[in-house]
C-alpha cells in the first residue's frame, strides 16, 4: 500500500494509473466503500462523502490513463485509506495528513518561549525535527518547545516530520519582539546635543502600544521617569516628559529622543521599556549618556567624565602634539600649572578613543579659552 | 506566497534543443501539476503539455509529442521542459503556470524567451 | 481539437463602460471554462474558473457566465487598469485550447 503525507490546509494528489494509455472509467473511493468520485464517460461525477466540495480528479491526464484524485484544503480527518477502481484493478493509497502550529502568537517577545504542536491522526507515530534560522535543532514528538528565544531565532523555522520513511516540511515564520541592541553607549561633551535612537528588530504592519524612559543619573539617589509616549501605527506622540530635561521625541519609528544638552546631572543610564499591544512582558533597551568636561581653575587644569563607564577605559590630559601628561583609568584627571597651548582631554578604550574635549590654555596673564 | 521563477532567456540555433526550468518558491510544490504555455511573439497562448505532482504522469498536445519532455525534480523544487528540433516557429515566450484541480492556471512563471535563428 | 472562438477579436472602450466578451466552443464543453487577462510584456492572470467562480483577490466587477458552447466575461464598470488583452481556456478535453483573444483598448 503507498503511503502519502499531506500537510493540513493544503492539496494532495493522489495518482491512479490504468495500463491502457486512453479514458477509461474510474471510481474512487474511501475505506468505507463510500464513492468520492469517478467519471461518466466524458463528464466527472461526485459521491456522497464527505470530501464532495473539496475533491476533484485532473481531466487533461484522464487520456493518458492517469486519473488522480485531488484533495484541497486538507484536514487531519482527510487521513484514510483511499481506493482507486479501473480496469477491475483497486489501487489503494494511505493518506496521513499532519498539521504543525505555533501554540501561541508567531510574534513573540524576546526571552519568551516557543511551543509547537504536531496535529496528526490517530494510530500514527511521527517524529519531528525543526531547525532554526540559526540553524539550531530541536527534536521531539508532539510538541517541540524553545524557551528563552533570542533575536537570531526570528525567521522561518523548518520543520521535518517523519512517518513510514516519508517526510513532509512544514515552514513557519517566526517574529522574535526586540531592539536591536540590548544597550547602547553616548558619549557626549558638555553642551552638545544628545541623540538616542532605539531601532526595532522587526517590522509589522501597524504597531501599537505605550513606552516609557525611566532614567538613573549617576548624581541622583533615585530613577525617575524622563518621558513617556505612546505609539499608534508607528506613530509617536509624547504624554508625560519632565521639566528637567525637556526630552524631544521623533513622530516616527524609529524611536528617537533628543537632549537638547549633555550635562553631567544627566550623565547615568535609562531604561526604555515599550509595552505592545496585546502582547504580555516588555521590550527593554538599555541606554547610557557619558559626559566629559575639561575646564581650568587658576593654576588647575581638570578633566572629568561622568556617567557608567567601564574600569579598563583610560582618562587623560595632553598637550597637543605631545605625550599624554597625565594618564589614569579615573574619572577625573588634572594637570597643576599647565603650559600654554591647547590642550585635549581624551576618553580612550584600548587605544580608540571614545571622546574628545579640547580646551586652550593661555599664557598666566591671560583668561583660558574654551573653544 | 508560491512563486514560479523561469530560467533566462536563450538563443538557440534550427535543429537544436532547449531546456527551460521553472522553480517554486514559497510553498508546496509537490502538491500541484505544472502546466507549460507558450506564445509567439504578437500571438494566443498555446498549451504544450501538463505535468503531475509526482513527475510519473504527463500529457503533452499531440503537436508537440515526441518533441517535449517535462520532467520535475522534488529535491529542488524545479520542473523543467525541455523542446528538441528546434524551428524558427518555436520562436516564443515559454511560461510555466501552476495547474489547480481543474486545469486552471492560477500561478505563472514570468516568462522564458527562448529565440530560433540561424 | 476543440475550437474556442472569441469575438470580438478588439474592443475600444471608455472607463465606466459595461464590457462583454464572448466564447464559442466547436463542441459541448459543459462548465470547464477559464477567462484569463494579459497586459503587454507580462504573464496571464486568471480571472474566472468553472465559467462563473471568481478566483481569488480578483475585483468584482469581473464575471462570467455560461454553459455547453456559449460563455461570456462581463467588466460591470471598466477600470483604466482593465485595459489588456482577455483569453478563455477550455479545459474538458486535451490538448487544452485557448480563444484567439480580445484586445481591450481605450476609446
Known amino acids: 500500500k503507498k503511503v502519502v503525507l499531506g500537510k493540513k490546509g493544503d492539496t494532495v494528489e493522489l495518482t491512479c494509473t490504468a495500463s491502457q494509455k486512453k479514458s477509461i472509467q474510474f471510481h474512487w473511493k474511501n475505506s468505507n466503500q463510500i464513492k468520492i468520485l469517478g467519471n461518466q464517460g466524458s463528464f466527472l461525477t461526485k459521491g456522497p462523502s464527505k470530501l464532495n466540495d473539496r475533491a476533484d480528479s485532473r481531466r487533461s491526464l484522464w487520456d493518458q490513463g492517469n486519473f488522480p484524485l485531488i484533495i484541497k484544503n486538507l484536514k487531519i480527518e482527510d487521513s484514510d485509506t483511499y481506493i482507486c477502481e479501473v480496469e477491475d484493478q483497486k489501487e489503494e493509497v494511505q493518506l496521513l495528513v499532519f498539521g504543525l502550529t505555533a501554540n501561541s502568537d508567531t510574534h513573540l517577545l524576546q526571552g519568551q518561549s516557543l511551543t509547537l504542536t504536531l496535529e496528526s491522526p490517530p494510530g500514527s507515530s511521527p517524529s519531528v525535527q525543526c531547525r532554526s534560522p540559526r540553524g539550531k535543532n530541536i527534536q521531539g514528538g508532539k510538541t517541540l518547545s524553545v524557551s528563552q528565544l533570542e533575536l537570531q531565532d526570528s525567521g522561518t523555522w523548518t520543520c521535518t516530520v517523519l512517518q513510514n520513511q516519508k517526510k513532509v516540511e512544514f515552514k513557519i515564520d517566526i517574529v522574535v519582539l526586540a531592539f536591536q541592541k540590548a544597550s547602547s553607549i553616548v558619549y557626549k561633551k558638555e553642551g552638545e546635543q544628545v541623540e538616542f535612537s532605539f531601532p526595532l528588530a522587526f517590522t509589522v504592519e501597524k504597531l501599537t502600544g505605550s513606552g516609557e524612559l525611566w532614567w538613573q543619573a549617576e548624581r541622583a539617589s533615585s530613577s525617575k521617569s524622563w518621558i513617556t509616549f505612546d505609539l499608534k501605527n508607528k506613530e509617536v506622540s509624547v504624554k508625560r516628559v519632565t521639566q528637567d530635561p525637556k526630552l524631544q521625541m521623533g513622530k516616527k519609528l524609529p524611536l528617537h529622543l533628543t537632549l537638547p544638552q549633555a550635562l553631567p546631572q544627566y550623565a547615568g543610564s535609562g531604561n526604555l521599556t515599550l509595552a505592545l499591544e496585546a502582547k504580555t512582558g516588555k521590550l527593554h533597551q538599555e541606554v547610557n549618556l557619558v559626559v566629559m568636561r575639561a575646564t581650568q581653575l587658576q593654576k588647575n587644569l581638570t578633566c572629568e567624565v561622568w556617567g557608567p563607564t567601564s574600569p579598563k577605559l583610560m582618562l587623560s590630559l595632553k598637550l597637543e602634539n605631545k605625550e599624554a601628561k597625565v594618564s589614569k583609568r579615573e574619572k577625573a584627571v588634572w594637570v597643576l600649572n599647565p603650559e600654554a597651548g591647547m590642550w585635549q582631554c581624551l576618553l580612550s578604550d584600548s587605544g580608540q578613543v571614545l571622546l574628545e574635549s579640547n580646551i586652550k590654555v593661555l599664557p598666566t596673564w591671560s583668561t583660558p579659552v574654551q573653544p | 506566497q508560491v512563486q514560479l521563477v523561469q530560467s533566462g532567456a536563450e538563443v538557440k540555433k534550427p535543429g537544436a534543443s532547449v531546456k527551460v526550468s521553472c522553480k517554486a518558491s514559497?510553498?508546496?510544490?509537490?502538491?500541484?501539476?505544472i502546466s507549460w504555455v507558450r506564445q509567439a511573439p504578437g500571438q494566443g497562448l498555446e498549451w504544450m503539455g501538463i505535468?503531475?505532482?509526482?513527475?510519473?504522469?504527463?500529457n503533452y498536445a499531440q503537436k508537440f509529442q515526441g518533441r517535449v519532455t517535462m520532467t520535475r525534480d522534488t529535491s529542488t523544487s524545479t520542473v523543467y521542459m525541455e523542446l528538441s528540433s528546434l524551428r524558427s516557429e518555436d520562436t516564443a515566450v515559454y511560461y510555466c503556470?501552476?495547474?489547480?484541480?481543474?486545469?486552471?492556471?492560477?500561478?505563472w512563471g514570468q516568462g522564458t524567451m527562448v529565440t530560433v535563428s540561424s | 481539437d476543440i475550437q474556442m472562438t472569441q469575438s470580438p477579436s478588439s474592443l475600444s472602450a471608455s472607463v465606466g463602460d459595461r464590457v462583454t466578451i464572448t466564447c464559442q466552443a466547436s463542441?459541448?464543453?459543459?462548465?470547464?471554462l477559464n477567462w484569463y487577462q494579459q497586459k503587454p510584456g507580462k504573464a496571464p492572470k486568471l480571472l474566472i474558473y468553472?465559467?462563473?467562480s471568481l478566483q481569488s483577490g480578483v475585483p468584482s466587477r469581473f464575471s462570467g457566465s455560461g454553459s455547453g458552447t456559449d460563455f461570456t466575461l462581463t467588466i460591470s464598470s471598466l477600470q483604466p487598469e482593465d485595459f489588456a488583452t482577455y483569453y478563455c481556456?477550455?479545459?474538458?478535453?486535451?490538448?487544452?485550447?485557448f480563444g484567439g483573444g480580445t484586445k481591450l483598448e481605450i476609446k
Open positions: 481556456q477550455q479545459t474538458y478535453n486535451t490538448p487544452l485550447t
Open positions: 468553472a465559467a462563473s
Open positions: 514559497g510553498g508546496t510544490f509537490s502538491s500541484y501539476a
Open positions: 463542441q459541448d464543453i459543459g462548465n470547464y
Open positions: 503556470a501552476r495547474d489547480i484541480s481543474n486545469d486552471a492556471f492560477d500561478i
Open positions: 505535468i503531475n505532482p509526482s513527475g510519473d504522469g504527463t
